[in-house]
Interface confidence: medium
Amino acid sequence: AGVFELQIHSFGPGPGPGAPRSPCSARLPCRLFFRVCLKPGLSEEAAESPCALGAALSARGPVYTEQPGAPAPDLPLPDGLLQVPFRDAWPGTFSFIIETWREELGDQIGGPAWSLLARVAGRRRLAAGGPWARDIQRAGAWELRFSYRARCEPPAVGTACTRLCRPRSAPSRCGPGLRPCAPLEDECEAPLVCRAGCSPEHGFCEQPGECRCLEGWTGPLCTVPVSTSSCLSPRGPSSATTGCLVPGPGPCDGNPCANGGSCSETPRSFECTCPRGFYGLRCEVSGVTCADGPCFNGGLCVGGADPDSAYICHCPPGFQGSNCEKRVDRCSLQPCRNGGLCLDLGHALRCRCRAGFAGPRCEHDLDDCAGRACANGGTCVEGGGAHRCSCALGFGGRDCRERADPCAARPCAHGGRCYAHFSGLVCACAPGYMGARCEFPVHPDGASALPAAPPGLRPGDPQRYL
């Protein structure tokens, strides 16, 4: 037995371009917490497979509010270690998953909202009792720095926490038959003591206080023969008891399922049906209760407060998994029609529609000019999903409702004076200039730069902009 300990040193933007936005804002302050999941061996199991070695949640970190305009800094972390107790031997090789979760503290309906910020995973070799191992893992633009170690809980010692050591009974040497527990020279190795009353003939243990049954025997103390109907075993009945050993042992003999689990044989092995509050291949992983806060992302935890009654997480829309830890990618179903952009906001699905389309799923094709009258003789032109009015002379604005001031833009050049006219504007040109906007100089010989004056107009007359 022992404890795996994880110390998070920092969580923040990693090096290189593309620094992540801060997960918190003034409008949505938040705080971080971490979850660690351990599995024995160098497995490459899916993230949602059971954490057979154990799992732990950290406390919540300090509340953080982003400073406007500042890059995302290393975020404030929870105090203390994450500790994962392990009951059996430390396997030496293990796989880990460390998740960084954000708890949003804004005005959320139904309490704080949780979302997974980053998940890192790895496979490592680690001897129990060794020094802290340091590690850096990156997930996208985030970087997590942490240390970890495995330590044995007395009386266990050794690189796998398998040797049991107890204080010496005498100062000079270890008591009956016991080796010193190097490097703890003042402690001695001890054999195992099974659960009190465990049958010495038919029970055994590999952990102190345990009572595991040999094939053909059952019961908490392995005193009940599985079958007493006949003594068909080639080895015959035990001389120490009246029970018989059962021939043809099967995978469920001795009941490999711990904690009251029931065993059923499968073609290749066995399967344990665990009581509420336990899981694992042999129901060896002790229960998590609602008090441990196992439901993520605002999932509602239902279940008893004691380890014998399991919990069920009722997940909010957009999340699934036994702990509501998996976000449903609802956008993968492409619910937005007509090229709309899908936004999964967690609590809701939103479609951002292209111009010309509307509706919750962009299903409505807009007739841009339908019901859109352009005033003062303007005509409606459809295009690009937004209606546009082409206004009659003297009017402007989105719906041609504004009377235009044609002189507002000072259209007359070279000091010409502008006069508003019912049909537009008229420029009275300064001496030496001519043209609709007074843009052409009059040549000294009296000839115009224009090929000819329009009929009915003499050079020098005020020019009307037609």
Partner: antibody
């Protein structure tokens, strides 16, 4: 019926390597600790190595520590002994044996043994 | 390590007579927490693997004839065959499993 069948023995030169296997049947292999015990020609029994039921703990005699590795594959019901840097004094019949339960228990079933001869 | 010493090295007994083999350990094999002696006795016939006879110093393995019995505690143990049969000719080993595993050197039992 409980059966343990060793294989992999043979003649090997000093410094060489050999891997012994022990195929188990007739019992729930994954519930029992297992050991390798050897017996030099005309000599007594010498325990070599032990492993607990789930493979998480190994134990070795001082004479083989660092050279031999015990392992098991519960999915194949097989026990292994990887022997490296073999010496002449490792010559023996190697038995695999089942403990009555955990490691701190007597050995109730033994295989027939496989002979390992280390000689140049 | 715990050293196991058997006596005698060899023994010749007439059929039907009592045979007694002794085993002494260099340290006590009695663990006070459970009051068990971590000692076993094995029988090995020529060309065969060992066979478990007795464990916990005095508990007979199932299928073993009741003429075999074990006794003793702490450091001194005895295997007794109350009435020797021809099939009992073998080498007998004591073994401790208190800390690691060690065997005695063996006692050869023959018919006188």
């Amino acid at each position: 019926e409980v059966q343990l069948l060793e294989s992999g023995g043979g003649l090997v030169q000093p410094g060489g390597s050999l891997r012994l296997s022990c195929a188990a049947s007739g019992f729930t292999f994954s519930s029992y600790a297992m050991s390798w015990v050897r017996q030099a020609p005309g000599k007594g029994l010498e325990w070599v190595a032990a492993i607990n039921s789930n493979g998480g703990r190994n134990y070795y005699a001082d004479s083989v520590k660092g050279r031999f590795t015990i392992s098991r594959d519960n999915s194949k019901n097989t026990l292994y002994l990887q022997m490296n840097s073999l010496r002449a004094e490792d010559t023996a019949v190697y038995y695999c044996a089942r403990h009555r339960g955990g490691y701190y228990y007597a050995m109730d079933y033994w295989g027939q043994g496989t002979l390992v001869t280390v000689s140049s | 390590d715990i050293v196991m010493t058997q006596s005698p090295d060899s023994l010749a007994v007439s059929l039907g007579e009592r045979a007694t083999i002794n085993c002494k350990s260099s340290q006590s094999l009695l663990y006070s927490s459970n009051q068990k002696n971590y000692l076993a006795w094995y029988q090995q016939k020529p060309g065969q693997p060992p066979k478990l006879l007795i464990y916990w110093a005095s508990t007979r393995e199932s299928g073993v004839p009741d003429r075999f019995s074990g006794s003793g505690s702490g450091t001194d143990f005895t295997l007794t065959i109350s009435s020797l049969q021809a099939e009992d000719v073998a080498v007998y080993y004591c073994q401790q499993y208190y800390t690691y595993l060690t065997f005695g050197q063996g006692t050869r039992l023959e018919i006188k």
